[in-house]
């Protein structure tokens, strides 16, 4: 018989139901926006906006200050009062649409859905390690703003993204707002604009540059601005919008818009379609050739990448990469593949593709039929002509007008579909050591911290835990404060360590000490933890072996048994070769001699499953008693592996030494030709790993083995005679004197 250890699924080495409690703050209402500030004097703050309220929190998430931002028309609205005596517009709740830091001052800028989407500026006043907001300044000059031209009307009730850029001594606000006909008719917000904050903080300078969805398209063509960021010489917006001005408006795709961060102009406004797909390793019949498209961006974040991912993406370590979580449609409903996929777009490649697209539009010879695009913003035209014109005039440049690059940038899911049913709603990417980690919030209120690698067929989790008991979706915007990330879910803000919330979800020592160095995990006798959790017994250098099972569960008191031990941390080396004298197995008082590994039995074990086997020959000592006992494996003096060395003892109960007893044999005669079915009856006949019935020294072929009975077919006899019959278990003879009589056939 060839018994094999059962495989242990990789998932059994971790428990994602372990409860972690991370610091949190109850904001008193649905969190609408959140931003963090870290000063250069060790002072820091978290700003959290809810309807009609702005909270200032310290780095410990304790409330430092609160401000009433609404309702507009309410005498208690502190921001409204900064605009002087009202009324300033229709009364109503203030939902915060923009919450950004102006790093130049530094100051916090908040813009809401009320008061024509105007903004308020709050100087930051660091006092000790805390930060307070000065009284708000109203960024609105009544005499400069009209319904048809309102430089101080920034936020759209449908959503606005803002990135602030310092240019010289001035702060420029790169603003992107979702519009519809009703919003556009009210104080004229723009789709994309660049606005300079006036030095006296009385609002934004008039005459700003802007692009807006043309009135005829406002009803059918809506653009959702998902994310904005500034890196290098550009500001980028990420949008979800209809793929075509003329076709079905529900057919959406994702675009990247690029604007110059060094010149407050929109002549070099460029758009590029981002294409993210799930391409399974084995393509199903009928599945699209390039993989299943996931056209709708849900969340995005850009970050420099660690060495390993950089190599996989064929870029240099530390280069900026845009990561996006994409779904199949607005509802993000389940398709054939996973609910969410993650694609990586190196910024350098995006810029190259855009620059090449511009050249393609503007260079000679002209590429016939190439459209400038962006027909929702500008009049249709063919390259190299400016919008709405038939030809270039001598004093205009093709390059000085907005352009949609004709080719899209395609990427495939980094996780190979392994996110499965998970619906990702928040994303923040960090580089820890040389590892790139995606910190993801989910629809059901969990945080997944996963290494970003593409070469594996399973996810490498730093952690996977529930933020609280509410199960509410984690919101899109994530902020970083020191070594923590701030996630919002419902009315709560949670502070999650970048290194993970802890180590208790790793259940085995091996999994614990194989965890990333940055997690600070160590073994505490019987659990995985960080040093502060168990300072006495915490160590990171060795793991005891772990016995999970053995076979067989019984063996003869006399004679040998080939014992197979199952578990983990036996070897640390795939070959399973054991240096002399490192492994000591005892069963009861008796030693079990290690057997060399049978190389023919070595089988590759996929990383998703793991099991280690160790075989030894058990020869009970004369002093060994019958009955139940323990199996003990002690490993010492093993050379260290990559992560730790094996050292220690594991004990498992459940082995029994038994004495086989033969009570009866029948029939006691049979033909000389052999083939008689012998039945041997007794007790403990099946113990151990080997048994033999010998008729005159020749083996009687065993047909059935059970605890109380053996069946075998007699071998042919040399002559008609009475011959000795014996039973050996584990190579030792079972007491008793039996004979079998060969008769004429």
């Amino acid at each position: 018989e060839d018994w094999q250890c059962p495989r242990t699924p990789y998932a059994a080495s971790r428990d994602f139901d372990v409860k972690y409690v991370v610091p949190s703050f109850s904001a008193g209402g649905l969190v609408q926006a959140m931003v963090t500030y870290e000063g250069d004097r060790n002072e820091s703050a978290v700003f959290v906006a809810i309807r009609n309220r702005l909270h200032v929190l310290g780095p410990d998430l304790k409330s430092v200050q609160s401000l009433a931002t609404g309702p507009a028309g309410d005498p208690g609205c502190q921001t409204c009062a900064a605009c002087g005596p009202g009324p300033h517009g229709p009364p109503g709740d203030t939902d915060t649409k923009v919450l950004v830091l102006d790093p130049a001052l530094p100051a916090l800028v908040s813009c809401g859905s009320s008061l024509q989407g105007r903004c308020f500026l709050h100087d930051l006043e660091p006092q000790g390690t805390a930060v307070h907001l000065a009284a708000p300044a109203c960024l609105f000059s009544a005499h400069h703003n009209r319904p048809d031209d309102c430089p101080d009307c920034v936020a759209s009730p449908l959503g606005t993204r803002v990135t602030v850029v310092e240019q010289g001594q001035a702060s420029y606000f790169y603003v992107a707002s979702s519009l519809d006909a009703a919003v556009a008719a009210s104080f004229s917000p723009r789709s994309v604009s660049i606005r300079r904050l006036k030095a006296d903080a009385s609002g934004f300078a008039p005459g700003f540059v802007a692009l807006s969805v043309l009135p005829k398209h406002l009803v059918s063509y809506s653009i959702e601005y998902v994310h904005s960021f500034h890196t290098g010489a550009f500001v980028y917006f990420l949008t979800v919008q209809p793929a075509s001005v003329t076709d079905d408006p529900s057919a959406l795709h994702t675009r990247l818009a690029r604007l110059s961060a060094t010149e407050p102009e929109l002549g070099d406004y460029r758009e590029l379609v981002l294409d993210c797909r799930f391409a399974p390793k084995r393509r199903r019949r009928g599945a699209p050739e390039g993989g299943q498209p996931y056209p709708v961006l849900r969340v995005a974040h850009s970050a420099p990448v660690g060495a390993q991912l950089a190599t996989e993406l064929s870029i240099a370590e530390g280069q900026e990469v845009l990561f996006g979580v994409f779904v199949t449609g607005k509802d993000g409903g389940p398709g054939v593949g996973p609910n969410s996929v993650v694609c990586a777009f190196p910024i350098d490649l995006l810029d190259t593709l855009i620059d090449e697209g511009v050249e393609r539009c503007c260079e000679s010879p002209v590429h016939p039929g190439l459209r400038r695009g962006l027909d929702f913003f500008q009049s249709p035209s063919f390259c190299p002509n400016p919008p709405g014109l038939e030809a270039l005039s001598p004093n205009t440049s093709c390059r000085h007008f907005p352009l949609l690059v004709s080719s899209s940038f395609s990427r495939v899911d980094l996780f190979n579909g392994l996110l499965g049913p998970v619906q990702v709603t928040a994303l923040y990417v960090t580089r820890l050591d040389n590892v790139t980690v995606a910190h993801m919030g989910t629809m059901d209120g969990r945080i997944l911290q996963v290494e970003l690698v593409r070469s594996l067929n399973y996810l490498l989790y730093v952690s996977n835990f529930s933020l609280g008991d509410s199960g509410q979706p984690v919101q899109r915007d994530v902020s970083r404060l020191g070594d923590h990330l701030l996630f919002a879910s419902g009315d709560q803000v949670f502070q999650v360590p970048i290194q993970g919330p802890g180590c208790r979800h790793f259940l085995t020592c091996g999994r614990c000490l194989r965890a990333w160095h940055f997690m600070g995990c160590g073994w505490c006798g019987n659990m995985c933890g960080q040093q502060k959790e168990c300072p006495g017994s915490w160590q990171q250098d060795h793991c005891p072996p772990k016995l999970t099972e053995f076979h067989p569960h019984s063996g003869p008191l006399r004679g040998s048994t080939r014992l197979t031990l199952c578990g983990s941390n036996f070897y640390l080396h795939p070959s399973g070769l054991v240096p002399e004298g490192t492994h000591q197995v005892t069963v009861g008082q008796s030693p079990c001699r290690p057997l060399p590994k049978d190389s023919s039995k070595l089988r590759p074990v996929p990383r998703k499953d793991f099991v280690e086997e160790f075989e030894c020959e058990l020869e009970p000592l004369g002093t060994q008693a019958v009955g139940p006992t323990n199996v003990s494996l002690t490993v010492t003096n093993m050379p260290p592996g990559k992560h730790f060395r094996v050292d220690g003892t594991s004990v498992l109960r459940g082995f029994s030494f038994m004495e086989p007893v033969l009570i009866a044999v029948q029939p006691l005669f049979g033909p000389r030709a052999g083939g008689t079915c012998l039945t041997l009856e007794g007790q403990s006949l099946s113990v151990g790993t080997s048994r033999a019935v010998l008729v005159n020294g020749t083996e009687c072929l065993l047909a059935r083995v059970s605890e109380g009975q053996l069946l075998c077919a007699t071998p042919p006899g040399a002559t008609v005679a009475s011959v000795p019959l014996s039973l050996q278990v584990g190579g030792a003879q079972v007491p008793g004197s039996w004979t079998f009589q060969y008769r004429e056939d």
């Epitope: 401000l67 005498p75 009062a81 001052l105 709050h122 930051l124 000065a134 009284a135 300044a137 903080a201």
Partner: antibody
Framework: QVQLVESGGGLVQPGGSLRLSCAAS????????MSWVRQAPGKGLEWVSY????????YYADSVKGRFTISRDNSKNTLYLQMNSLRAEDTAVYYC??????????WGQGTLVTVSS | DIVLTQSPATLSLSPGERATLSCRAS???????LGWYQQKPGQAPRLLIY???NRATGVPARFSGSGSGTDFTLTISSLEPEDFATYYC?????????FGQGTKVEIK
């Protein structure tokens, strides 16, 4: 220790101008909002003006709006109050005070402004 | 503008007695952006309480502030000789910031 010292007060005719200064020391001036508060002889305290740490926000009492201008020079750790079109009812001791959210926690000793013909 | 009304205008008490000073706002003061100040003749005011109930640095424990919304109270649990002075409340919630007219605590 924190010190606020006002200067620039004196006698001025109605319609005239004065510029008050407040020299700050002993703390990080550019981290604090500052205010001017005045007290007419035998009367209570009257808040006059407020300026945030980086001058982004300035507030004024209705009684001085359009006539007084608050400013600060963080490089000189100094707060100013430019007073134009002075009236007899502006006669008071003018105090500069530090702080906003935690109240006005430090005050100068005041400088007297007398508007009289 | 938020008008702060302090009462009583004058409070005549003996040392060791408890003083209760009231400050009523014409409209709600959000998040308790309200302070109490003490002023003695010929001196600059001194901050006692901020945020309606937080004692400023160095202020003795006999001074306490309470209240929220529109009604605020300053309590001196046991008057010491040096506590006889004029007390002002101030809101710094809504522009323009305003002071109450003051309560004078005098020796009976």
């Amino acid at each position: 220790q924190v010190q606020l010292v006002e200067s620039g007060g004196g006698l001025v005719q109605p319609g005239g101008s004065l510029r008050l200064s407040c020299a700050a020391s002993g703390f990080t001036f550019n981290s604090y909002s500052m205010s001017w508060v005045r007290q007419a002889p035998g009367k209570g305290l009257e808040w006059v003006s407020y300026i945030s740490s980086r001058s982004s926000t300035t507030y004024y009492a209705d009684s001085v709006k359009g006539r007084f201008t608050i400013s600060r020079d963080n490089s000189k750790n100094t707060l100013y109050l430019q007073m134009n079109s002075l009236r007899a009812e502006d006669t008071a001791v003018y105090y500069c005070a530090r702080g906003y959210f935690h109240g006005m926690d430090y005050w100068g000793q005041g400088t007297l402004v007398t508007v009289s013909s | 503008d938020i008008v702060l009304t302090q009462s009583p205008a004058t409070l005549s008490l003996s040392p060791g007695e408890r003083a209760t000073l009231s400050c009523r706002a014409s409209q709600s003061v959000s998040f308790d952006y309200l302070g109490w100040y003490q002023q003695k003749p010929g001196q600059a005011p001194r901050l006692l309480i901020y945020g309606a109930s937080n004692r400023a640095t160095g202020v003795p424990a006999r001074f306490s502030g309470s209240g929220s919304g529109t009604d605020f109270t300053l309590t001196i649990s046991s008057l010491e000789p040096e506590d006889f002075a004029t007390y002002y409340c101030q809101q710094y919630n809504i522009n323009p910031f305003t002071f109450g007219q003051g309560t004078k605590v005098e020796i009976k």
